[in-house]
């Protein structure tokens, strides 16, 4: 699991590859702060609850965020 409690940032390794939006349980976007100087995106998968860190600079990940946001706006009244 690419997470660590010993460093200020949560993510150690990040992926440029998107996942299927439908396989996501949760998508957390953690803004840069005094504790971690970069934006972090943590995807929790429905299958096994596995967590993955995604690269916010990757175009494919930006496309994923757009797709998730569009999906959510469809669902909300």
């Amino acid at each position: 699991v690419p997470l660590s409690r010993t460093v200020r940032c949560t993510c150690i390794s990040i992926s440029n590859q998107p996942v299927n939006p439908r396989s996501l349980e949760k998508l957390e976007i953690i803004p840069a702060s005094q504790f971690c100087p970069r934006v972090e995106i943590i995807a929790t998968m429905k299958k096994k609850g596995e967590k993955r860190c995604l690269n916010p600079e990757s175009k494919a990940i930006k496309n994923l965020l757009k797709a998730v946001s569009k999906e959510r706006s469809k669902r909300s009244p």
Epitope: P21, S58, N63, A67
Partner: antibody
């Protein structure tokens, strides 16, 4: 040199199953997603979907849900596309294409595999 | 899904001519368009990405421009080896779409 080498041409009967391979070399297989594209005879390119090579999770375009299966063998750096219950309209050239996910376009393609479905 | 309308579907031009192909998206694709060249029996080859960025090794006679929904691919001086079919690809979405293709022939 980055290369995607696909398996050879296949001739199948309707109702059969075909499995195409795409073996990569020249880069770390799990660093890039792998996409599949279909081209029917005399027609244009149609995107079929992709597989996340880190976790082996496939995503299919709407027109390619059901009979299509994308899989991986990371030990041999090979992606596979399997198509079951073949029909004559599945006759096409199938391409694998590496996606440069950071920028999100297809930068390297396999040479294509011709699948002919005929009774 | 984002639809891409490519025109013309075929085009006949002479060596040395300036050739222009257009792709129109049904929504803003934020310049995330790539252009591919495909010769008969061969795989598509990437020429340009992000509207106008030329791939290494691709001749400078190939260029691209556009923004929003409208994009143009240009060959400034057509060469005999440019005879091929050209496709646009939008990648501003998780769901990719190609244009229908433009078959380029020599007069």
């Amino acid at each position: 040199e980055v290369q995607l080498v696909q398996s050879g041409a296949e001739v199948k009967k309707p109702g059969a199953t075909v499995k195409i391979s795409c073996k990569v070399s020249g880069y770390t297989f799990t660093d890039y997603s792998m996409h599949w594209v279909r081209q029917a005879p005399g027609k244009g390119l149609k995107w079929m979907g992709w597989i996340n090579t880190e976790i082996g999770e496939p995503t299919y375009a709407d027109d390619f849900k059901g009979r299509f299966t994308f899989t991986l063998d990371t030990s041999t750096s090979t992606a596979y596309m399997e198509l079951s219950s073949l029909r004559s309209e599945d006759t096409a050239v199938y391409y694998c294409a590496r996606n440069y996910d950071y920028d999100a376009y297809f930068d390297v393609w396999g040479q294509g595999t011709t699948v002919t479905v005929s009774s | 899904d984002i639809q891409m309308t490519q025109s013309p579907s075929s085009l006949s031009a002479s060596v040395g001519d300036r050739v222009t192909i257009t792709c129109k998206a049904d929504q803003d694709i934020n310049k995330y368009i790539a252009w591919y060249q495909q010769k008969p029996g061969k795989a598509p080859k990437l020429l340009l990405h992000h509207t106008s960025t030329l791939q290494p090794g691709i001749p400078s006679r190939f260029s691209g421009s556009g923004s929003g929904r409208d994009y143009t691919f240009t060959i400034s001086s057509l060469q005999p080896e440019d005879i091929a079919t050209y496709y646009c690809l939008q990648y501003d979405s998780l769901l990719f779409t190609f244009g229908q293709g433009t078959k380029l022939e020599i007069k």
